[in-house]
């Protein structure tokens, strides 16, 4: 049902979902002082630009009695419930953050007339893709994808001299939500990655991936995983690997192998990791030594939804349009904005582009050493390290296919 | 062990400047939003100023706007004060502090305080 908003006559309000099932178990007090931050810089912007409005936020909490996974598995429901609760309240604002499981986003989109712009921290699955009112500020899985599509077609490169069209996927169902889909993407028969590929298998158990590791007859060297580099240790141990196996390891939201101290352990060396650049993290901040990589930049994308509201509601009302109109709810996308740290670029979609960072790690140093990045936003990799001193031979990438190339 | 270490105060006439200084040490500066209160003789601590981490954002006190800029040098780890048309009531003890946003800095829920630089100015 059409629900009055909160969100005229110089006076803003933003719907907080804050719910019990999230894409990343962050305590929601964190949450509460991204956004408000985020609306200090707000109010300073506007105020600023010579605009006297007021802008609030209010926090819809789930009760949690009845959806209490904590995680994303029951999180369906549970959207639905809060935009009940909202319904009910007659409290929505001029837009709605939140949610950020893949399930509760595309539910709420499927089951409610929007008129109003949904921001996500999260919705990582392709479902949730080409939605008009629905913006994502963590890099969605179609983005992942195009990445691996276009480095396997790569073969100009001096490191990078075959094109590949093989892989295996390893996916066990344990994966946190941000893998979960990434992976679910790449398994997908119907997806861009399962298109542009000859061959793809999807490895569940652990003993599938040990194999293969040193299997003459595999069908591909590449495997593909997700996750850091202690779920790495922890399925492969100190096993042998076969000298033209390829690990591409994806841990976008993982800034750690940036720091200066950082070593690089030798069941990483055959490991290219797929991360985002890193930026200004808090990451070494004492305040959040207790946060996980991902869960810093899960409060970060709040609060750069919250800032991307405020630079939509600055556009609107200088321009003197109505706030709450069809207009305004299409109108989160194909754009840039001053987030947090920097400029925050959104595509023709709503979703957040990004630098992507391949790394590798050099046999003489036991660094982490970047070897291209990958700009999401014109599908684009540029190479930065043309001679890595790689552990495969010739320092190249082999064939994806053994028995061809550098072996 | 973090250390903020201010400098550049002193005794000034009304209407003179100012420009205070804070040198971090023993933290990542750029991951952390930077700010200033002062605190007058016989009066509650005062927030003046924050400024974000990447330097994009600027807050300020009422009392401090238009008059106060502050800036930072995430390459030098140094957090800046320029005080403009100084007025005897900005008389104080200033102190150059540290927090996660500028929300909590604000707020001073869990900041890293500094030593303080005093300013006098005198009518």
């Known amino acids: 049902s059409q629900v009055s908003q909160n969100c005229h006559n110089g006076s803003y309000e933003i719907s907080v979902l804050m719910m019990g099932n999230s894409a990343f178990a962050e305590p929601l007090k964190n949450l509460e002082d991204a956004v408000n931050e985020g609306l200090e810089i707000v109010r300073g912007r506007l105020q600023n630009a010579g605009l006297n409005v007021t802008v609030n936020a209010t926090f819809m909490y789930s009760d949690g009695l009845i959806h209490n996974s904590g995680d994303c598995r029951s999180s369906t429901c549970e959207g639905l419930d809060l935009l009940r609760k909202i319904s009910n309240a007659q409290r929505m604002g001029c837009v709605l953050i939140g949610p950020s499981c893949t399930y509760s986003t595309f539910q709420m989109y499927l089951d409610t007339e929007l008129s109003y712009p949904m921001i996500s921290a999260g919705s990582f699955g392709l479902s949730c893709d080409y939605k008009e009112t629905l913006t994502r500020l963590m890099s969605p899985a179609r983005k992942l994808m195009y990445f691996l599509v276009n480095f396997w077609k790569t073969n100009d490169l001096p490191f990078k001299t075959y094109s590949w069209s093989t892989s295996y996927v390893y996916k066990n169902g344990t994966e946190t939500e941000d893998c979960f889909w990434y992976l679910n993407a790449l398994e997908a028969s119907v997806s861009y990655f399962s298109h542009e590929l000859g061959f793809k298998v999807v490895l569940r158990q652990d003993k599938e991936f040990q194999d293969i590791l040193m299997d003459h007859n595999r069908k591909s060297n590449v495997i593909i995983m997700c996750g850091g580099p202690e779920f790495l240790y922890k399925l492969k141990g100190d096993r042998a690997v076969a000298e033209d196996i390829v690990i591409i390891l994806v841990d976008l939201f993982n800034d750690q192998y940036f720091e200066d101290n950082v070593t690089a352990p030798d069941y990483m060396k055959n490991v290219l990791v797929l991360t985002l650049s890193p930026g200004n993290s808090l990451l070494n901040s004492s305040f959040s030594r207790n946060l996980s990589p991902t869960k810093r930049d899960f409060a970060l994308a709040y609060l750069n939804g919250i800032l991307l509201f405020g630079h939509m509601l600055k556009i609107f009302l200088e321009n003197g349009e109505n706030i709450t109109t069809p207009k305004f709810a299409h109108a989160f996308r194909n754009l840039t904005f001053e987030g947090y740290d920097g400029p925050v670029t959104l595509d023709d979609w709503g979703d957040v582009d990004s630098t992507m960072v391949l790394l590798y790690t050099s046999v003489d140093t036991k660094k982490y050493k970047v070897l291209l990045t990958y700009d999401t936003h014109v599908n684009k990799t540029y190479p930065v390290d043309m001679s890595p001193t790689f552990t495969w031979k010739n320092s190249k990438l082999p064939n994806d296919i053994t028995g061809r190339g550098p072996q | 062990q973090m250390q903020l270490v201010e400098s550049g105060g002193g005794l000034v006439q009304a209407g003179g400047s100012l420009r205070l200084s804070c040198i971090a040490s023993?933290?990542?500066?750029?991951?952390?939003?930077m700010g200033w209160f002062r605190q007058a003789p016989g009066k509650e601590r005062e927030w003046v100023s924050c400024?974000?981490?990447?330097?994009?954002?600027?807050l300020y006190a009422d009392s401090a706007k238009g008059r106060f800029t502050i800036s930072r040098d995430n390459a030098k780890n140094t957090l800046f004060l320029q005080m403009n048309s100084l007025k005897p009531e900005d008389t104080a003890m200033y102190y150059c502090?540290?927090?996660?946003?500028?929300?909590?800095?604000?707020?001073?829920?869990?900041?890293?305080w500094g030593q303080g630089t005093q300013v006098t100015v005198s009518s």
């Open positions: 023993g933290l990542t500066f750029p991951t952390y939003a």
């Open positions: 400024v974000t981490r990447s330097g994009g954002d600027t």
């Open positions: 502090v540290a927090a996660l946003f500028c929300h909590n800095l604000r707020l001073n829920t869990g900041n890293y």
